[in-house]
C-alpha cells in the first residue's frame, strides 16, 4: 500500500498473508475457519502456499500468528490466466486445518449480491496489505491500510487503454500518491457498515502504483458472492 | 375517588383560568396538577390543534405539538404524514444491515451470519464470540471512519 498508514494489531483481523517457499507474495481475507478468499493470479502451479493469519509485523514472529497449509485452491471457473490474468481474478483457498477465531483472527462479512453492490456504492472502502510502500520500492513489514474512494466507471475507462470489465471496479486518487501495490494482490477491499466490515473487492491489478491519473483495479465481489458461499459452506 | 367529578372540576377551573382570560403555563398547571396533561393542553391552547385537519394518512395517529404535529404511522408506512410505503429502497427501511419485505409486505430487518436483530428490530448485535467484520481488540484508537 502506497501512502497508507500502519494498522494497529487486530485492526484488520480478516487479513491474511500468503507465503510461498521463500517470500510472501499476496494477501487474502478469511471467509470462515477453513477458507480464505484471494486473487486467482496469486495461485502459481506447483507452488506450496502457506496462509498466515493474525500477522502484523512480518519481520518478527508473533504469538497471534496462525499458519496453515492450503490443500485446495479454486480459482473462479471463468478464470483463465492464458487469456487474461486479471479477468475474474478471484480464488478460494481451503486450509488444511481450521483457524482458531479470536480478536486477531476473524472472518470478513460477505453480504448477498445486491447488498455487496449497495455497500460498494457507499463510495469509500479500505484496502490493506504488506505490499510495496513505493512504486517499485520495498514491501511493508507492518500491515498498511488506506481509505480509497470509488472511481466512476467512465473516469476509470478513460484512464487506461486496458479493458475494465463489469466484474471489476476502480478506486483511488486522481492526484496519485495513494494506492494498493504489488504484494497487496488478493487482499481485501472492505466497506464499513455501522461498525461491521463487508468484503466489497479483491485487490487485483493496476498500472504501476499510485501514479497520477491512474487507479487501482479491484475484482467486484458482488459478482461472486453466491459462488463464494456455495463453495465455502461448512458442513 | 370519582374521576367524573374531578374532570368536571378541572373543566370549570379551566374555563375560569384560561378561557375567560389568557393564562400562563404555570396557571394551567395549577388546574391540571400534572405536567404531562398540562403540556397536552398547552400545545393546543397556544396555537390551536394542528391535528384538527387529520393530516396523518393511512391510519396514522396524530400528536399535536406547538406549531407542528407528529404522525405515528401504522406498520408499513412512513414519511411526515405516513404518505410513503415503508420500503427497503427508502433509507434501507431504517435497517442497519439488511432489509426485506415479508409476506404481509412489511419491512423486516435482518443481519449477516453471526449477528442477530437487536431489541429495536433494526440494529444488529453479535450472536457469536468473534462475529465477522468486527474489530474486537479494545485498545484500537484509530477508528476506520475518519
Amino acid at each position: 500500500v502506497v501512502g497508507g498508514e500502519d494498522a494497529e494489531r487486530g485492526q484488520f483481523p480478516w487479513q491474511v498473508l500468503l507465503h510461498g517457499e521463500i517470500a510472501a507474495f499476496c494477501g487474502g481475507s478469511i471467509v470462515n475457519e477453513k477458507w480464505v478468499v484471494t486473487a486467482a493470479h496469486c495461485i502459481k502451479p506447483g507452488v506450496k502456499i502457506t496462509v498466515v493469519a493474525g500477522e502484523h509485523n512480518t519481520e518478527k514472529p508473533e504469538p497471534t500468528e496462525q499458519k496453515r497449509n492450503v490443500i485446495r485452491a479454486i480459482p473462479y471457473h471463468s478464470y483463465n490466466a492464458s487469456i487474461n490474468k486479471y479477468s475474474h481474478d478471484i480464488a478460494l483457498l481451503e486450509l488444511d486445518e481450521p483457524l482458531e477465531l479470536n480478536s486477531y483472527v476473524t472472518p470478513i462479512c460477505i453480504a448477498d449480491r445486491d447488498y455487496t453492490n449497495i455497500f460498494l456504492k457507499f463510495g469509500y472502502g479500505y484496502v490493506s496489505g504488506w505490499g510495496k510502500v513505493f512504486n517499485r520500492g520495498r514491501s511493508a513489514s507492518i500491515l498498511q491500510y488506506l481509505k480509497v474512494p470509488l472511481v466512476d466507471r467512465a473516469t476509470c475507462l478513460r484512464s487506461t487503454k486496458f479493458s475494465i470489465y463489469s466484474h471489476m471496479f476502480c478506486a483511488g486518487y486522481h492526484e496519485g500518491g495513494k494506492d494498493s501495490c504489488q504484494g497487496d494482490s488478493g487482499g481485501p477491499h472492505v466497506t464499513e457498515v455501522e461498525g461491521t466490515s463487508f468484503l466489497t473487492g479483491i485487490i487485483s491489478w493496476g498500472e504501476e502504483c499510485a501514479m497520477k491519473g491512474k487507479y487501482g483495479i479491484y475484482t467486484k465481489v458482488s459478482r461472486y458472492v453466491n459462488w463464494i458461499k456455495e463453495k465455502t459452506k461448512l458442513t | 375517588y370519582n374521576s367524573g367529578k374531578l374532570e368536571e372540576f378541572v373543566r370549570g377551573n379551566l374555563e375560569r383560568e384560561c378561557k375567560e382570560e389568557k393564562c400562563s403555563f404555570e396557571e394551567a398547571r395549577e388546574v391540571f396538577e400534572n405536567t404531562e396533561k398540562t403540556t397536552e393542553f398547552w400545545k393546543q391552547y397556544v396555537d390551536g390543534d394542528q391535528c384538527e385537519s387529520n393530516p396523518c394518512l393511512n391510519g396514522g395517529m396524530c400528536k399535536d405539538d406547538i406549531n407542528s404535529y407528529e404522525c405515528w404511522c401504522q406498520a408499513g408506512f412512513e414519511g411526515t404524514n405516513c404518505e410513503l410505503d415503508a420500503t427497503c429502497s427508502i433509507k434501507n427501511g431504517r435497517c442497519k444491515q439488511f432489509c426485506k419485505r415479508d409476506t404481509d409486505n412489511k419491512v423486516v430487518c435482518s443481519c449477516t451470519d453471526g449477528y442477530r436483530l437487536a431489541e429495536d428490530q433494526k440494529s444488529c448485535e453479535p450472536a457469536v464470540p468473534f462475529p465477522c467484520g468486527r474489530v474486537s481488540v479494545s485498545h484500537i484508537s484509530k477508528k476506520l471512519t475518519r
Epitope: 517457499e21 521463500i22 502451479p45 497449509n69 490443500i71 480459482p75 488444511d96 486445518e97 458442513t235 | -
Partner: antibody, heavy 125, light 106 residues
C-alpha cells in the same frame, strides 16, 4: 522424472532408535512437502506426518508425536525420519511420499503423488 | 479424527465385470483420493480429487461421491487390477486412510 529413493531395511532392538532416509530427485526439493506413511504387517496405511523442506515446518499425527522426528537436508535433497523408543508395534514398512498440487479444471488439489519404495523396519530382540 | 470405512474388505471379481468399492467417512470431507497398492510395492495414486484420474491411470477407473460417501468403480476388471485399494482424506488432521479393499480376480 520424479523419484524418491529410500534407505535399506533395518533390524533394530526394542528401545533403540533408527533414522530412515528418503532422497528426492527430479523436482525442486524445497517446494513440496514430504510425507511419511507406515504400513504394519497385513494392515492398512497410517499417516505419520509431513515436513516442508522450504522452511522446515512440520505437522505430525498426534498419536505418533514423540515417536517420529522429521528433518531434511536441503543440500542433498534428502528427508529423514528418526524413530525412537522402538517396540514391536513399530515393526512396519515406512514410506516417504511427496505431496504436490494437482491441477484439474483450473483448480489445484493436494495429493501424495510419488512414493518411495519403502523401508522395512523390524523391531526384535 | 475422520474414520474412513471401506467395503467390502475383500472382493472377488471376474474379468470384464464392473465393480464398485465404497468408502464412508465419519465426517464430511471435501474430496477423496484413491490409491492402488499391488503386492510388495508402494501405493500408487489412482484418483486425486474424488473423480479425476492421475496421470497414466486407465479410463476404466472412475470415482464419484461427496460429503461422507465416496466410491471407486472399475468398469471392466482386468487381471492387472488385482490389488489393495485405499481411500484417503486430506480434509482434516490427522490424514487418514480407509482399511482397504482387497480385489481378487477369479
Amino acid at each position: 522424472q520424479v523419484q524418491m529413493q529410500q534407505s535399506g531395511a533395518e533390524l533394530v532392538k526394542p528401545g533403540a532408535s533408527v533414522k530412515l532416509s528418503c532422497k528426492a530427485s527430479g523436482y525442486t526439493f524445497t517446494s513440496q512437502d514430504i510425507n511419511w506413511v507406515r504400513q504394519r504387517p497385513e494392515q492398512g496405511l497410517e499417516w505419520i506426518g509431513w515436513i516442508f523442506p522450504g522452511d522446515g515446518s512440520t505437522k505430525y499425527n498426534e498419536k505418533l508425536k514423540g515417536k517420529a522426528t522429521l528433518t531434511t537436508d536441503k543440500s542433498s535433497s534428502t528427508a529423514f525420519m528418526q524413530l525412537s523408543r522402538l517396540t514391536s508395534e513399530d515393526s512396519a514398512v515406512y514410506f516417504c511420499a511427496r505431496s504436490a498440487y494437482y491441477r484439474y479444471d483450473g483448480s489445484y488439489y493436494y495429493a501424495m503423488d510419488y512414493w518411495g519404495q519403502g523401508t522395512s523396519v523390524t523391531v526384535s530382540s | 479424527q475422520i474414520v474412513l470405512t471401506q467395503s467390502p474388505a475383500i472382493m472377488s471379481a471376474s474379468l470384464g465385470e464392473e465393480i464398485t468399492l465404497t468408502c464412508s467417512a465419519s465426517s464430511s470431507v471435501s474430496y477423496m483420493l484413491w490409491y492402488q497398492q499391488k503386492s510388495g510395492t508402494s501405493p500408487k495414486l489412482l484418483i486425486y480429487t474424488t473423480s479425476n484420474l492421475a496421470s497414466g491411470v486407465p479410463s476404466r477407473f472412475s470415482g464419484t461421491g461427496s460429503g461422507t460417501f465416496y466410491s471407486l468403480t472399475i468398469s471392466s476388471v482386468e487381471a492387472e487390477d488385482a490389488a489393495d485399494y485405499y481411500c484417503h482424506q486430506w480434509s482434516s488432521y490427522p490424514r487418514t486412510f480407509g482399511g482397504g479393499t482387497k480385489l481378487e480376480i477369479k
